[in-house]
């Protein structure tokens, strides 16, 4: 047994650009509080999965009102440590979630409103009894600085809090088979104290308060022999004496559920059904009342006036779970446009936009031509996240930087000769033809099929195409 302790040092804007807006204002003062959730092991678990090692809420911090025009400073914090007691061994490796919550103190109907400001998570290795470990975590534009440690509660000692120590009975040495307790050399390691009443012949324990049964015995105190009249047990080694299957150790053997909880096996482990007033993986958390504020996200707590009565959280729309800790999947409505990826950050929805799109919901088709110059008099044409240049005559390529041969396509009709020109091409027409592309025959009487030629331009002159 022991306690995980968390000390929050600061919560405020992180380094770099894009300082966050202050969470409080003169119109809407607020205060912060923190929630820590611990899970054993280094598994990548969902934020909603149970806090199997325990959870704790901090006190509320001082009321904070933003000073107009001032950048968001480090925000005033609650006093004291967050403490998460653990009853069993400290696992050594653990995952944590630390949430920063804002309690708005304006004139809300139905009491103060809570909203999640930031959530940080991590996976760490930590030996119980060691020094404080310091950490810095960032969540968006916010930065959280904190320290943590795990310490054993006497008489437990060791990196997992599984060894027990007692003061020495004699000044010189410990009892038979028992070592001195480092670093408490004046104390001796004590034998494990199994669950009260655990059969000394048929039961044993690997952790304090446990009672695990030897093969052939069952019951919470390992005092009930396994029946050999029925050979229907689905698991365990065959018994040499009876030829029947004797149940091997199952997840509910020794009843891991504390405080009168009843154990039922699940495909992967066990599940405890807790009596009123208790909850947690092993019914180890007790005495939570509505006064402790167990309902998150503005959930309404009903019942639970005293530690022996259960509470129920009535969740506001958008939240679910026994403590309103789970957020409904809002991204399933696909609010992001143009193929953007939806991210539910808890306090807000965010869209990660595809190239060529921007805006909170990827609703803006970026100006593909912004900052894109088409050379040599070309004009930029937008199109679905990419740009292209419509080049002036004589130029080609993606940015109109390549000089094109305007005569390559043989544009001059009826044997006219083509000449490249800085402003395009010029056709020198064969006798009897005229026009920009020598496309019009000249009639023998001097009239042409064209409207009258512009002044100064005679039929048969080279026609410049602009």
């Amino acid at each position: 047994a022991g306690v995980f302790e968390l000390q929050i040092h600061s919560f405020g804007p992180g380094p770099g650009p894009g300082a966050p807006r202050s969470p409080c204002s003169a119109r809407l003062p607020c205060r912060l509080f923190f929630r820590v959730c611990l899970k054993p092991g280094l598994s990548e678990e969902a934020a909603e999965s149970p806090c199997a090692l325990g959870a704790a809420l901090s006190a509320r911090g001082p009321v904070y009102t933003e000073q107009p025009g001032a950048p968001a400073p480090d925000l005033p914090l609650p006093d004291g440590l967050l403490q998460v007691p653990f009853r069993d061994a400290w696992p050594g490796t653990f995952s944590f979630i630390i949430e920063t919550w804002r309690e708005e103190l304006g004139d809300q109907i139905g009491g103060p409103a809570w909203s999640l400001l930031a959530r940080v998570a991590g996976r760490r290795r930590l030996a119980a009894g060691g020094p404080w470990a310091r950490d810095i975590q960032r969540a968006g534009a916010w930065e959280l600085r904190f320290s943590y440690r795990a310490r054993c509660e006497p008489p437990a000692v060791g990196t997992a809090c599984t060894r027990l120590c007692r003061p020495r009975s004699a000044p010189s040495r410990c009892g038979p088979g028992l070592r001195p307790c480092a670093p408490l050399e004046d104390e001796c390691e004590a034998p494990l104290v199994c669950r009260a009443g655990c059969s000394p012949e048929h039961g044993f324990c690997e952790q304090p308060g446990e009672c695990r049964c030897l093969e052939g015995w069952t019951g919470p105190l390992c005092t009930v022999p396994v029946s050999t009249s029925s050979c229907l047990s689905p698991r365990g080694p065959s018994s040499a004496t009876t030829g029947c299957l004797v149940p091997g150790p199952g997840p509910c053997d020794g009843n891991p559920c504390a405080n009168g909880g009843s154990c039922s096996e699940t495909p992967r482990s066990f599940e405890c059904t807790c009596p009123r007033g208790f909850y947690g993986l092993r019914c180890e958390v007790s005495g939570v009342t509505c006064a402790d504020g167990p309902c998150f996200n503005g959930g309404l707590c009903v019942g639970g006036a005293d530690p022996d009565s259960a509470y129920i959280c009535h969740c506001p729309p958008g939240f679910q779970g026994s403590n309103c800790e789970k957020r409904v999947d809002r991204c399933s409505l696909q609010p992001c446009r143009n193929g953007g990826l939806c991210l539910d950050l808890g306090h807000a929805l965010r869209c990660r936009c595809r190239a060529g799109f921007a805006g909170p919901r990827c609703e803006h088709d970026l100006d593909d031509c912004a900052g894109r110059a088409c050379a040599n008099g070309g004009t930029c044409v937008e199109g679905g996240g990419a740009h292209r240049c419509s080049c002036a005559l004589g130029f080609g390529g993606r940015d109109c930087r390549e000089r094109a041969d305007p005569c390559a396509a043989r544009p001059c009709a009826h044997g006219g000769r083509c000449y490249a020109h800085f402003s395009g091409l010029v056709c020198a027409c064969a006798p009897g033809y005229m026009g920009a592309r020598c496309e019009f025959p000249v009639h023998p009487d001097g009239a042409s099929a064209l409207p009258a030629a512009p002044p100064g331009l005679r039929p048969g002159d080279p026609q410049r195409y602009l």
């Epitope: 958008g318 809002r330 409505l333 696909q334 609010p335 992001c336 446009r337 143009n338 953007g340 929805l349 909170p360 919901r361 990827c362 609703e363």
Partner: nanobody
């Protein structure tokens, strides 16, 4: 502030029909996405049908061919026409909307829910 007001829930026999409506009001600049979720006792809340941000319609597999979502943009209202109702459709139906507010930021809103009960 934005309000979503649902109506049309009630009790109906298997095979029957109901029409839910949800009207959005308040400081709305535009409605980006809007639809219906439902939550049966002891179950997670799930999307039933909705208009996505791109304006397309989306349906849960279990209601395709039986439920139809429609909208009246002028009234900022969505409707859910539910036909061939089954016992497993019994749930509280919640309206949800992703709204661009007049101040130009987006917020996600929920209605208070309307109960649909399908029983013989």
């Amino acid at each position: 502030e934005v309000q979503l007001v649902e109506s049309g829930g009630g009790e109906v026999q298997p095979g029957g029909s109901l029409r839910l409506s949800c009207a959005a009001s308040g400081s709305i600049f535009s409605i980006n996405a809007m639809g219906w979720y439902r939550q049966a006792p002891g179950k997670q809340r799930e999307l039933v049908a909705g208009f996505t941000g791109d304006g397309s319609t989306k349906y849960a597999e279990s209601v395709k061919g039986r439920f139809t979502i429609s909208r009246d943009n002028a009234k900022n209202t969505v409707y859910l026409q539910m036909s061939s109702l089954r016992a497993e459709d019994t749930a509280v139906y919640y309206c949800a909307a992703d709204v661009q507010l007049l101040q130009s930021d987006y917020e996600f809103y929920w209605g208070q829910g309307t109960l649909v009960t399908v029983k013989p």
